[in-house]
Interface confidence: low
């Protein structure tokens, strides 16, 4: 397959509600009409697939109903949001982009976004 450059931010801090968003941008070498975006998580040398979506250019990304990811696309940029994160989910989140159609097939893998997740402190009991 042919290589393609993918850019993503180095570091993102998840919100107190466990939501992290980042942009994954790819340098499309041609007119792609079908694109597949996969988010991989690397932690302790283990790589697991977090979520994936295939979309037609100009249409919305559609993740599975039970996916923790949502996203939108604009040109060669994909805005990804991962929800329900906890401290234990801290890790390197890698954006993988595949230009599926028309041929030739292109594959690009970003360097990863380090997402830091801090569990919120429980609210102290209040006596009134």
């Amino acid at each position: 397959c042919k290589a393609m450059h993918v850019a993503q931010p180095a570091v993102v801090l998840a919100s107190s509600r466990g939501i992290a968003s980042f942009v994954c941008e790819y340098a499309s070498p041609g007119k792609a009409t079908e694109v597949r975006v996969t988010v991989l998580r690397q932690a302790d040398s283990q790589v697991t697939e977090v979520c994936a979506a295939t979309y037609m250019m100009g249409n919305e990304l559609t993740f599975l109903d039970d996916s923790i990811c949502t996203g939108t696309s604009s040109g060669n940029q994909v805005n990804l949001t991962i929800q329900g994160l906890r401290a234990m989910d801290t890790g390197l989140y890698i954006c993988k982009v595949e230009l599926m159609y028309p041929p030739p097939y292109y594959l690009g893998i970003g360097n990863g976004t380090q997402i830091y997740v801090i569990d919120p402190e429980p609210c102290p009991d209040s006596d009134f």
Partner: antibody
Framework: QLQLQESGPGLVKPSETLSLTCTVS??????????WGWIRQPPGKGLEWIGS???????YYNPSLKSRVTISVDTSKNQFSLELSSVAAADTAVYYC????????????????WGQGTLVTVSS | EIVMTQSPATLSLSPGERATLSCRAS???????LSWYQQRPGQAPRLLIY???TRATGIPARFSGSGSGTDFTLTISSLQPEDFAVYYC?????????FGQGTKLEIK
Amino acid sequence: QLQLQESGPGLVKPSETLSLTCTVSGGSISSSSYYWGWIRQPPGKGLEWIGSIYYSGSTYYNPSLKSRVTISVDTSKNQFSLELSSVAAADTAVYYCARVSYYYGSGSYYFDYWGQGTLVTVSS
Amino acid sequence: EIVMTQSPATLSLSPGERATLSCRASQSVSSSYLSWYQQRPGQAPRLLIYGASTRATGIPARFSGSGSGTDFTLTISSLQPEDFAVYYCQQDYNLPYTFGQGTKLEIK
């Protein structure tokens, strides 16, 4: 077992429009994993790709035929169709419909299921 | 468009012999974007090999594909009577998809 079946008139007059339909059974045309294509073969000659369509309606045509070709899909009927306008004797061929599969391992595309083909003769 | 050229046009061999069919692309199609099809008289083509070297489901091990760049080969290790047919190569590196003109494998 997936099956594809072409249907349409076997004789078309010059300058008219050739219309064929491919009915898919044993699988859904709406699968995101596949495209659907038309290929033709003039008598005694080789194969020529006409075009392909995705279930969403995205089409890809051979530039040599693009100005005359329309491929459409009807997911409710599990069918896709070919229209070729302004036909001439040179368009006489066996027309095949086929499934276009994608191999994730290498990124290659290939025609893995074919209809039996239908001969269309262009003659007055 | 990418032009696919097959050789020889006709190959005459006997059952049990080894057949080597060649396919050349007018420009590089990498190592993966080539398929081979078999067509018997009066039948639709049948997929044999995709990705240059991966056998399709149900295809016997005597069929093998190799090559990269512009030169590809289909090998049939020991010809069976049902193997005598026309063979086509096809590239999917770029649109439009293009086929070779075919090699007719006939009984000697």
